[in-house]
Interface confidence: low
């Protein structure tokens, strides 16, 4: 349904401050290191030019694509050459080149100081003096730092914080109330931004099919009661917004999700029989509530899957009219009869079928060769229980610092050469599933981590694609999407890396480690794990646990002594000089 | 998994002397951070005195300094606590504790270490009994 003007009709559909907000959102996400005022103000002219397309479609410049009306707003910023360098370049460049151009600078680490917390009472101040700015203010801030953040979710955690805000604001015990919000806001968004850069990825490095087939698991898991060509609408329509997202599309996509909701509402019937509670919430708590959705129940009596893909006679036959529709109907009956699996290992069954139906149908006699297809299936399902099962155990055992500590070590010890706070956060993150995944019975461990670890894993590859260092990286990122994490568990010591210099200044430190909180003192503590595995790649645990024993207790004794600077310097030269004794440097 | 046996206790009068030792088996001793703690009748376990791997960080509850003395032999897998100069209220069960440093007992930061290691010893023994009668 083609439109006069494209500007008009979104900002009609999604009403003044949706509209503002994720024009907000998107130039943020484009010029990740430009002002907040300077946004405000791009948006205000953006939206000042669209009331007057609302009032007349015919208006000069309404008729312009939306890509062409924001491409032209962001060219007009002054300072684009010596803020972003080769980025200007794309100014040059003709719609659509012009767009794909901008969303190959979009910085996935940008070098933005870290979001430092106020007192509650200044941020109760701010937020009462100009609510309208302050919840700008977040959307702005966590657009830019979280370029692929999906932008009608972001709207969603906009509203809580505003709720956060006005419910603690006018509490007895103001930070009691917020900071335990702001937390879990936090946690929830870093998980978020991450969930959708893994879309973002599947759809740009490896192409809609990709994104297609994991929808299809992970929708056929959550609505097992939906019918095959059902669950192809809802994947269609969600390929669409996701694609629009992740294209920089912001409005569009915004506007299709809010009708998927709708649709899916409409049509819970002969979806699942738990949206329900989601499907009476307002517009951006019921998308997000249908995103979050738990599984329905299976139908019963499920026949077996072998008599139409394995026993029948007509399956080379029906693979030949229609391979993807047939390999879909494969992974939607495989993937409804199995919500204990990970999205990822029913997508490697399905690629294991194609395989053998691509050899086998060419083959003299087709039913013969693939006669045991499911068998070639049991050490693929195997392979990520018994992983899962023992990394649970060593879990259990360690806890989840510890935890952390030993990825940490295997991690570097695969892959030295990815930068120190890259290894850090990614072997963090990695060990978190151990608290995220291990407690669920062993029904819901496996969806739990393997599908959490691709996530993990997909930030390792995309920060790594920044700047590559390392081949084996780029092998496991590329190769395979739903292997990436078979690929990772399977490298081995890196054995040609050359040990880096033992450089001192990298274990010298001062009065201010004495301030951090828990979790920043970790990070200092596995920061210098990861360097001294990158000094002495072949030390034994023993050693490492030493050498960091010494380090933590020298740094304990420092920020307790009067003089801790003094402390950190003469002691610290001590501590240097035994770990290299220690260590055999 | 590590084993610990603590030894030396009994009882002694106000001003006495006992050395308490601790012998750890099933693991790599000398890679492990060792710590004193005790726990009077009704009260919590708390820290007395810790010492790193390698004997170069020690740490005291303020109530035993210049009385108590921790050190540590790696090639007999023990600790020691020499108590001299006892106190009725240090009368009770002590514990030796050990902490798996690639976990990092001693935390970094502001706070003292006994609260960190405490919580983070990973092996504990049965205990051994001391009492000060005045």
């Known amino acids: 349904d083609a439109h006069k003007s494209e500007v008009a009709h979104r900002f009609k559909d999604l009403g003044e401050e949706n509209f503002k907000a994720l024009v907000l959102i998107a130039f943020a996400q484009y010029l990740q290191q430009c002002p907040f005022e300077d946004h405000v103000k791009l948006v205000n002219e953006v939206t000042e030019f669209a009331k007057t397309c609302v009032a007349d479609e015919s208006a000069e410049n309404c008729d312009k694509s939306l890509h062409t009306l924001f491409g032209d707003k962001l060219c007009t910023v002054a300072t684009l050459r010596e803020t972003y360098g080769e980025m200007a370049d794309c100014c040059a460049k003709q719609e659509p080149e012009r767009n794909e151009c901008f969303l190959q600078h979009k910085d996935d680490n940008p070098n933005l100081p870290r979001l430092v917390r106020p007192e509650v009472d200044v941020m109760c101040t701010a937020f009462h003096d100009n609510e309208e700015t302050f919840l700008k203010k977040y959307l702005y801030e966590i657009a830019r730092r979280h370029p692929y953040f999906y932008a009608p979710e972001l709207l969603f955690f906009a509203k809580r914080y505003k709720a956060a805000f006005t419910e603690c604001c006018q509490a007895a015990d103001k930070a009691a109330c917020l900071l335990p919000k702001l937390d879990e806001l936090r946690d929830e968004g870093k998980a978020s931004s991450a969930k959708q850069r893994l879309k973002c990825a599947s759809l740009q490095k490896f192409g809609e099919r990709a994104f297609k087939a994991w929808a299809v698991a992970r929708l056929s898991q959550r609505f097992p009661k939906a019918e095959f060509a059902e669950v192809s609408k809802l994947v269609t329509d969600l390929t669409k917004v996701h694609t629009e997202c992740c294209h920089g599309d912001l409005l569009e996509c915004a506007d299709d999700r809010a009708d998927l909701a709708k649709y899916i509402c409409e049509n819970q019937d002969s979806i699942s029989s738990k949206l329900k509670e989601c499907c009476e919430k307002p517009l951006l708590e019921k998308s997000h509530c249908i995103a979050e959705v738990e599984n329905d129940e299976m139908p019963a009596d499920l026949p077996s899957l072998a008599a139409d893909f394995v026993e029948s006679k007509d399956v080379c036959k029906n693979y030949a009219e229609a391979k993807d529709v047939f390999l879909g109907m494969f992974l939607y009956e495989y993937a409804r009869r199995h919500p204990d699996y990970s999205v990822v290992l029913l997508l490697r069954l399905a690629k294991t079928y194609e395989t053998t139906l691509e050899k086998c149908c060419a083959a003299a006699d087709p039913h013969e060769c693939y006669a045991k297809v499911f068998d070639e299936f049991k050490p693929l399902v195997e392979e990520p229980q018994n992983l899962i099962k023992q990394n649970c155990e060593l879990f259990e055992q360690l806890g989840e610092y510890k935890f952390q500590n030993a990825l940490l070590v295997r991690y570097t010890k695969k892959v030295p050469q990815v930068s120190t706070p890259t290894l850090v956060e990614v072997s963090r993150n990695l060990g978190k599933v151990g608290s995220k995944c291990c407690k669920h019975p062993e029904a819901k461990r496996m969806p739990c981590a393997e599908d959490y670890l691709s996530v993990v894993l997909n930030q390792l590859c995309v920060l790594h694609e920044k700047t590559p260092v390392s081949d084996r990286v780029t092998k496991c990122c590329t190769e395979s999407l739903v292997n990436r994490r078979p690929c990772f568990s399977a490298l081995e010591v890196d054995e040609t890396y050359v040990p880096k210099e033992f450089n001192a200044e990298t274990f010298t430190f001062h009065a201010d480690i004495c301030t951090l909180s828990e979790k920043e003192r970790q990070i200092k503590k596995q920061t210098a794990l990861v360097e001294l595995v990158k000094h002495k790649p072949k030390a034994t645990k023993e050693q490492l646990k030493a050498v960091m024993d010494d380090f933590a207790a020298f740094v304990e004794k420092c920020c307790k002594a009067d003089d801790k600077e003094t402390c950190f310097a003469e002691e610290g030269k001590k501590l240097v000089a035994a770990s290299q004794a220690a260590l055999g440097l | 998994d590590v084993q610990l046996v603590e030894s030396g206790g009994g009882s002694v009068q106000a001003g006495g002397s006992l050395r308490l030792s601790c012998a750890a088996s099933?693991?790599?001793?000398?890679?492990?951070?060792m710590g004193w703690y005790r726990q009077a009748p009704g009260k919590e376990r708390e820290f007395v005195s810790g010492?790193?791997?390698?004997?170069?960080?020690?740490d005291y509850v303020d109530s035993v300094k210049g009385r108590f003395t921790i050190s540590r032999d790696n090639a007999k897998n023990t600790v020691y606590l020499q108590m001299n100069s006892l106190k009725p209220e240090d009368t009770a069960v002590y514990y030796c504790?050990?902490?798996?440093?690639?976990?990092?007992?001693?935390?970094?930061?502001?706070?003292?270490?006994?609260?960190?290691?405490?919580?983070?010893?990973?092996?504990w023994g049965q205990g051994t009994q001391v009492t000060v009668s005045s």
């Open positions: 010492i790193s791997w390698s004997g170069s960080s020690i």
């Open positions: 099933g693991g790599t001793f000398s890679s492990y951070a």
């Open positions: 504790g050990a902490a798996d440093p690639m976990g990092l007992g001693y935390g970094l930061g502001p706070r003292p270490v006994d609260r960190l290691l405490s919580a983070e010893c990973d092996y």
